[in-house]
Structure formats: C-alpha cells, structure tokens
C-alpha cells in the first residue's frame, strides 16, 4: 500500500540541529549559515500504529539513505539507533514496531515517543555536540520537544 511521506529537518526546542556523527549516530548542535546544510534531512512516513487520540504513528528515515531510526534493547536499556534496511522494502505501511514513533504535536512542538517502549522519547542533551538518544524522562533536563521544517526540493 502507498505511504504518505514528507521531507523535513528537525530542531530541538533549543534550536539545535541534528547532524550525522559517524555512520550510525546522530548528534545535536547549534548550526548557522552554510553549516545548516550539514543537518540531516528526514523522510517522515505515516505508518500503521496503535490507536490514540493525539498520537500519530510515523517512521523516521534518513532521506535517500537506507537508514531508519529504531528503538531496541541494549544492555537491558531502550536505545535509539540508526538501522540499515533494504531500500526495496521501505518505507512500508506496516513498519516493524521498533521503527515506529508516536508523533505528538502540540502548539507546533513535536515529541516522538517510541511505540516499542512507551514513555521513552527521542531526546537531546542540553550540552552541545552530544548524541541524540532515547530518554525515559519528559520535562527534565533532557530535551524532548522538536520543531519541524519542510525541506524544499
């Protein structure tokens, strides 16, 4: 079945941009001017997920790369990773649960809750140049709010 997708960038609520840090990690840092071109472009897709009033299930791929954000247990802790997929088969409507995030959109702010691990969110640190990670607290030191910007082709 066809999947609705869009291309976008994400910045955390402190306006830090997301960039690649090695082949399988994202980090968050402040960018300006031409450096903004370093930021990752996501292909966000509307996928099948569990029902909830203000949660919309999405998958977050890296545009024109066969990489998707996924949530897995590592050393018994929910962990965010970039996972390689077969580009012939992705994106698809029925994504495996580890790839699914519940997008919560309130007042132009977005949160991305792991469908696999409820109450765990895509997060950034207050500090500069730190990895993007899966965090189990909301409203604490770590940042779970993002803004989205469409990317013009």
């Amino acid at each position: 079945a066809p999947v609705r997708s869009l291309n976008c960038t994400l910045r955390d609520s402190q306006q830090k941009s997301l960039v690649m840090s090695g082949p399988y990690e994202l980090k968050a840092l402040h960018l300006q001017g031409q450096d903004m071109e370093q930021q990752v472009v996501f292909s966000m897709s509307f996928v099948q997920g569990e029902e909830s009033n203000d949660k919309i299930p999405v998958a977050l791929g890296l545009k024109e790369k066969n990489l998707y954000l996924s949530c897995v247990l590592k050393d018994d802790k929910p962990t965010l990773q970039l996972e390689s997929v077969d580009p012939k088969n992705y994106p698809k409507k029925k994504m495996e649960k580890r790839f699914v995030f519940n997008k919560i959109e309130i007042n132009n702010k977005l949160e991305f809750e792991s469908a696999q691990f409820p109450n765990w969110y895509i997060s950034t640190s207050q500090a500069e140049n730190m990895p993007v990670f899966l965090g189990g607290t909301k409203g604490g030191q770590d940042i779970t709010d993002f803004t989205m910007q469409f990317v013009s082709s």
């Epitope: 079945a1 066809p2 609705r4 509307f46 009033n53 803004t147 910007q149 990317v151 082709s153």
Partner: antibody, heavy 119, light 108 residues
Framework: EVQLVESGGGLVQPGGSLRLSCTAS????????MAWVRQAPGKGLEWVGI???????YYASWAKGRFTISRDTSKNTVYLQMNSLRAEDTAVYYC?????????????WGQGTLVTVSS | DIVMTQSPSTLSASVGDRVTITCQAS??????LSWYQQKPGKAPKLLIY???TLASGVPSRFSGSGSGAEFTLTISSLQPDDFATYYC??????????FGQGTKLEIK
Amino acid sequence: EVQLVESGGGLVQPGGSLRLSCTASGFSLSSAAMAWVRQAPGKGLEWVGIIYDSASTYYASWAKGRFTISRDTSKNTVYLQMNSLRAEDTAVYYCARERAIFSGDFVLWGQGTLVTVSS
Amino acid sequence: DIVMTQSPSTLSASVGDRVTITCQASQSISSYLSWYQQKPGKAPKLLIYRASTLASGVPSRFSGSGSGAEFTLTISSLQPDDFATYYCQNTGGGINIAFGQGTKLEIK
C-alpha cells in the same frame, strides 16, 4: 489573526486553466500541511489533494494529471493549478490546514473561492 | 478507493431531540474518522477527530463513536444552532482522503 484567504476564482471556458492561491496569515507554511477541498453547487465535499514539502504532494485519483498543488513559503502561499477544466469542475474551492502532520483532518479553512467552468 | 456512506441523507428533528447520524466505510479504517459541520455559504468546521475526540471549542453535546467500518455522530440535545449539514471523513489509512456525501439536519 490565524486565517486562510483564497483568491483566483472566476469564470473560465472548458479546456481552460486557472491558478488559485491560498495565503496564510498568523502562522508559517514552512511546517504546515495544506490541502484543497472542493464543493460543487448543492453537493458534498470532495478532497482534491494535499502538500507537505514541495516534493511531497498527494492527490485524489480523479485529480492526478490535471491538478497540481505547489507552495511558495516566502509568500506564505499555496497554489492550485487547474488545467483542462471541465463543467464538472465548477465548485467552491477551499484550502485547509491539516490539524497535525498526517492527521488527515482539517481544523482551519479559508472562505472558499468559486470557480465556474462554462462557455 | 475507500467509499464513505452516510445515513440518513436528510434528517428532520426538533430542538431538544437526540439525533444520531451514521457513517459506514467500504472497508475498515480503524478509528481514522472525523466529523464536520457545515452551514450554508460557510466553510466546514471540524467537530470530532479520531472517531471520538472533540475538537477544540466544540460543545459537549456532540459525541462520536465507532471503529472499523461503522461510526456514529450523536447530538444529545439539539440546539437551534445545530441545524446544518454534517460530513464524515476518512482521514487515514492510505493516500486518499474521502468524505461522506453529507447528512442535512433540518427543523421538523
């Protein structure tokens, strides 16, 4: 004030073209999904299509090929280009903002602009 | 494409009545359904989304229920301002978004 204003409607001959505009105020189109919905006189609502980023547009099956949605973020405006118009395209055309990305429902609507296709 | 069918097409009722409008999808759409109210010469207004969630500012006399392929919109006690045309809409699932044909609620 948050609002949408459509313009560009009018009388056009069959086979002709028309471009409708929808200008947003009070919010930025740089992160808002925008749809076009039409309503023929005395008839129901009919979804035309939706635009996310400029490369991500989706259309009703009947609109593909004849209708094109585009956006100019610098002007905070979305467009509906309509080609090869037919009498059955006569309708009020509304633009509407998606409530949340991929929600598929529309919480903010313009006042509509009437397109009449007739010779 | 998924087809949305509303019933009845026209409904006559009086102020204070409890009224129910039904919407049927040609296949399961889970709870991806919204309801709109439209008055003559005006744009539609979102009432309910995700089958049962009241949109901001909508009076609590409106309620929605259902999932799969059968949905209902209920107005618990009709007010004069409620006489209008109501539309259901399939909001998710695939690429196409589809509206029902509408139900005109008129004064008896």
